[in-house]
Interface confidence: medium
């Protein structure tokens, strides 16, 4: 599923991401935009043999199990395919674990490069939340 901007903002808010670990909803929507272009079925392969999955591009070396990433830790204890569902529950729950890990949203390269320090509230402007 490819979410609309405000549709995703509303779904993320319902799942408790607004101000989770101090990150406003705009940060999460911005991250999703530049990680996956709001596409729940996005997959991207990395040079280390791991793959990033879903709307928040969660990595198989650390967070989920895709059955083929050497040394996978599967810290979210889920199959990576669950992160590709049109229901973003699994991605949100895993993202909460990632953002609580110590580096905050710096774990997402796209957030660090495209969202951090910008007017992230613009990503939820005009949305009925």
């Amino acid at each position: 599923k490819v979410f609309g901007r405000c549709e995703l903002a509303a779904a993320m808010k319902r799942h408790g991401l607004d101000n989770y670990r101090g990150y406003s909803l705009g940060n999460w929507v911005c991250a999703a935009k530049f990680e996956s272009n709001f596409n729940t079925q996005a997959t991207n392969r990395n040079t280390d043999g791991s793959t990033d999955y879903g709307i928040l591009q969660i990595n198989s070396r650390w967070w989920c199990n895709d059955g083929r990433t050497p040394g996978s830790r599967n810290l979210c204890n889920i199959p990576c395919s669950a992160l590709l569902s049109s229901d973003i529950t699994a991605s949100v729950n895993c993202a909460k674990k990632i953002v609580s890990d110590g580096n905050g949203m710096n774990a997402w390269v796209a957030w660090r490069n495209r969202c951090k320090g910008t007017d992230v509230q613009a990503w939820i402007r005009g949305c009925r939340l």
Epitope: Q41, T43, G49, D66, R68, P70, C80, S81, L84
Partner: antibody, heavy 116, light 107 residues
Framework: QVQLQESGAEVMKPGASVKISCKAT????????IEWVKQRPGHGLEWIGE????????YYNEKFKGKATFTADTSSNTAYMQLSSLTSEDSAVYYC?????????WGQGTTLTVSS | DIELTQSPATLSVTPGDSVSLSCRAS??????LHWYQQKSHESPRLLIK???QSSSGIPSRFSGSGSGTDFTLSINSVETEDFGMYFC?????????FGGGTKLEIK
């Protein structure tokens, strides 16, 4: 136990298309990548590409882009590979395998013969 | 693409001999190297994964070693059922690639 069952041998004319199937049993089909591999005598094994059935995400070896198309039906636990514009170079045995980085589980292979 | 070169192309041995098969990668692939056996008209069978880890049900006479770019499959005291083709495969990057194979034949 995990099994991959491929469709039977095919004889096709040049220019035609063929669709090979790979039915998976014994595991959660949507969760694992299915890989496709080509084997021609004297050419060894060639990786064609892969599909993740749960999402339909696909990756292709550049060499096979435009030649192979992968699909999957999660209701029947079956992956498909369509080969188009067939030539004699496409005559080969085609395998599906479960994509665990290494391939422990393989189908029995589908022999494709392209001949006028 | 990563190229895998296997040598020798053919190895003629007598049952009971011990042999080593080589696989060389065109660039470092860490430990992401796997070995397969294939007999005529059969699907490949995984022998060794990640350089040295034995696959389920594989006899202990098969072992693997190496790192980086140079890898070896060793068979200690070859048995008649071991004759066939052997392929290496890398999973360090895409596209996945296989070596050209080594044919193990009876002398």
């Amino acid at each position: 136990q995990v099994q991959l069952q491929e469709s039977g041998a095919e004889v096709m004319k040049p220019g035609a298309s063929v669709k090979i199937s790979c039915k998976a049993t014994g595991y959660t089909f949507s969760t694992y990548w299915i890989e496709w591999v080509k084997q021609r005598p004297g050419h060894g094994l060639e990786w064609i590409g892969e599909i993740l059935p749960g999402s339909g995400s696909t990756y292709y070896n550049e060499k096979f882009k435009g030649k192979a198309t992968f699909t999957a039906d999660t209701s029947s636990n079956t992956a498909y590979m369509q080969l188009s514009s067939l030539t004699s170079e496409d005559s080969a045995v085609y395998y599906c395998a479960r994509g665990d980085g290494n391939y422990y589980y393989w189908g029995q292979g589908t022999t494709l013969t392209v001949s006028s | 693409d990563i190229e895998l070169t296997q040598s020798p192309a053919t190895l003629s041995v007598t049952p009971g001999d011990s042999v080593s098969l080589s696989c060389r990668a065109s660039q470092s692939i860490s430990n992401n190297l796997h070995w397969y056996q294939q007999k005529s008209h059969e699907s490949p069978r995984l022998l060794i994964k990640y350089v040295s880890q034995s696959s389920s049900g594989i006899p202990s006479r098969f072992s693997g070693s190496g790192s980086g770019t140079d890898f070896t499959l060793s068979i200690n005291s070859v048995e008649t059922e071991d004759f066939g083709m052997y392929f290496c495969q890398q999973s360090n990057s895409w596209p996945r690639t296989f070596g050209g194979g080594t044919k193990l034949e009876i002398k």
